[in-house]
């Protein structure tokens, strides 16, 4: 896991601002497989490449998210970029972080997890990142990932880095993060739950 997400991000980051805008508009009307919902227009149009990548992965999971991205790129006439994306995702499905088993995303739970729904707010408003990292260490984050997040200079960049690992997490892993958020900044969770 993670390889497809990185490939999607690479593709989207290589789009011009105008192309990214066009990509989003096409995403609003592209045919979807049965059982998949559409990313809400309001949220979609304001996203940067990184936010959009995370949204694609959280809505459609990595494999279908990459396939969908390639279809939209092809529809835009960007065949070479679509081909590169598909080639990158077919190099191997990738693995969960060394030694940490991340089972497939739970299909039993409908909709988005709280941490995916409120990604932008959490990046902007979480201040006690160290608390979260300590709670997730070993259980969800490898030592390497843990140190990578800590190395970031600001709380928002720490949280952004932390969120770069979440596409490989299942629902239970995300629950661990939510639980840690409740312990460290319960008022923030309550505020977001009300919003």
């Amino acid at each position: 896991m993670g390889r497809a997400r990185d490939a999607i991000l690479d593709a989207l980051e290589n789009l011009t601002a105008e192309e990214l805008k066009k990509f989003k508009l096409k995403l609003l009307s592209v045919p979807l497989r049965e059982g998949y919902g559409r990313i809400p227009r309001g949220a979609l149009l304001s996203m940067d490449a990184l936010d959009l990548t995370d949204k694609l992965v959280s809505f459609y999971l990595e494999t279908y998210g990459a396939e969908l991205t390639a279809n939209v790129l092809r529809d835009m006439g960007l065949q070479e970029m679509a081909g590169q994306l598909q080639a990158a995702t077919h190099q191997g499905s990738g693995a969960a972080p060394a030694g940490i088993q991340a089972p497939p995303q739970s299909a039993a739970k409908p909709g988005l997890h709280f941490i995916d729904q409120h990604r932008a707010a959490l990046i902007a408003r979480v201040t006690n990142v160290e608390w979260l990292l300590d709670a997730l260490y070993g259980k969800v984050l490898t030592d390497e990932q843990y140190q990578a997040v800590r190395a970031e200079p600001t709380n928002p960049s720490k949280m952004r880095k932390l969120f770069s690992f979440t596409p490989a997490w299942n629902w239970t892993c995300k629950d661990l993060l939510l639980q840690a958020l409740r312990e460290s900044q319960s008022y923030l969770v309550e505020d977001l739950e009300r919003s």
């Epitope: 060394a98 030694g99 940490i100 088993q101 709670a135 260490y137 070993g138 259980k139 490898t142 140190q147």
Partner: antibody, heavy 117, light 107 residues
Framework: EVQLQQSGAELVRPGSSVKMSCKTS????????ISWVIQRPEQGLEWIGY????????EYNEKFKGKATLTSDTSSNTAYMQLSNLASEDSAIYFC??????????WGQGTTLTVSS | DIQMTQTTSSLSASLGDRVTISCSAS??????LNWFQQKPNGTVRLLIY???SLHSGVPSRFSGSGSGTDYSLTISNLEPEDIATYYC?????????FGGGTKLEIK
């Protein structure tokens, strides 16, 4: 009450292997990690490695890679450490320790290992 | 690896004394420092975690402080049961490392 009960003293021959256990009680085993620490005679403490029970994730001190192997059995709430190719310098007390939020909070009583021919 | 140094290997004090044991790290450890007590019978227990947080069941006469590379454990009113060896340990970076220990004795 949190408890970590370690297996009894071992006397083994050089070149052999040993597997010591750490039976836990008083907490949800799968929510924590178990670390192992060595204390050689008349010396201080040295970290060997740890295992997170929920996912089997392990990290080892480079010095002990190939020497120690950490495993666990969730059905009996027990963590294990196997030491291989034993030599006299492996004679020591070995502690298992619960990890909570990356720090060690509760220690076992220690298992004494003597390697002698 | 981060080296943890306890410069005083043994310390003698009288009952009721205020005792301070110091520990220094070879690089900054962001307050990720624990203090452990090992009794003469070998049992080990956590006293202080994250530099200054008192572990449950530990008497309030124990306290910890420090930042960056320099840390200390203070026992404000020495009691007979405090006879032990005290170890600091960093958990900032792998491999997690311990100081060499400070053996506390009663005068």
């Amino acid at each position: 009450e949190v408890q970590l009960q370690q297996s009894g003293a071992e006397l083994v021959r050089p070149g052999s292997s040993v597997k010591m256990s750490c039976k836990t009680s008083g907490f949800t085993f799968t929510s924590y990690g178990i670390s192992w620490v060595i204390q050689r005679p008349e010396q201080g403490l040295e970290w060997i490695g740890y295992i997170y029970i929920r996912n089997g994730y392990t990290e080892y001190n480079e010095k002990f890679k190939g020497k120690a192997t950490l495993t666990s059995d969730t059905s009996s709430n027990t963590a294990y450490m196997q030491l291989s190719n034993l030599a006299s310098e492996d004679s020591a007390i070995y502690f298992c320790v619960r990890i909570h939020r990356r720090f060690f909070d509760y220690w076992g009583q220690g298992t004494t290992l003597t390697v002698s021919s | 690896d981060i080296q943890m140094t306890q410069t005083t290997s043994s310390l003698s004090a009288s009952l009721g004394d205020r005792v301070t044991i110091s520990c220094s790290a070879s690089q900054g450890i962001s307050n990720y420092l624990n203090w452990f007590q090992q009794k003469p019978n070998g049992t080990v227990r956590l006293l202080i975690y994250y530099t200054s947080s008192l572990h449950s069941g530990v008497p309030s006469r124990f306290s910890g402080s420090g930042s960056g590379t320099d840390y200390s454990l203070t026992i404000s009113n020495l009691e007979p049961e405090d006879i032990a060896t005290y170890y600091c340990q960093q958990y900032d970076r792998l491999p997690w490392t311990f100081g060499g220990g400070t053996k506390l004795e009663i005068k």
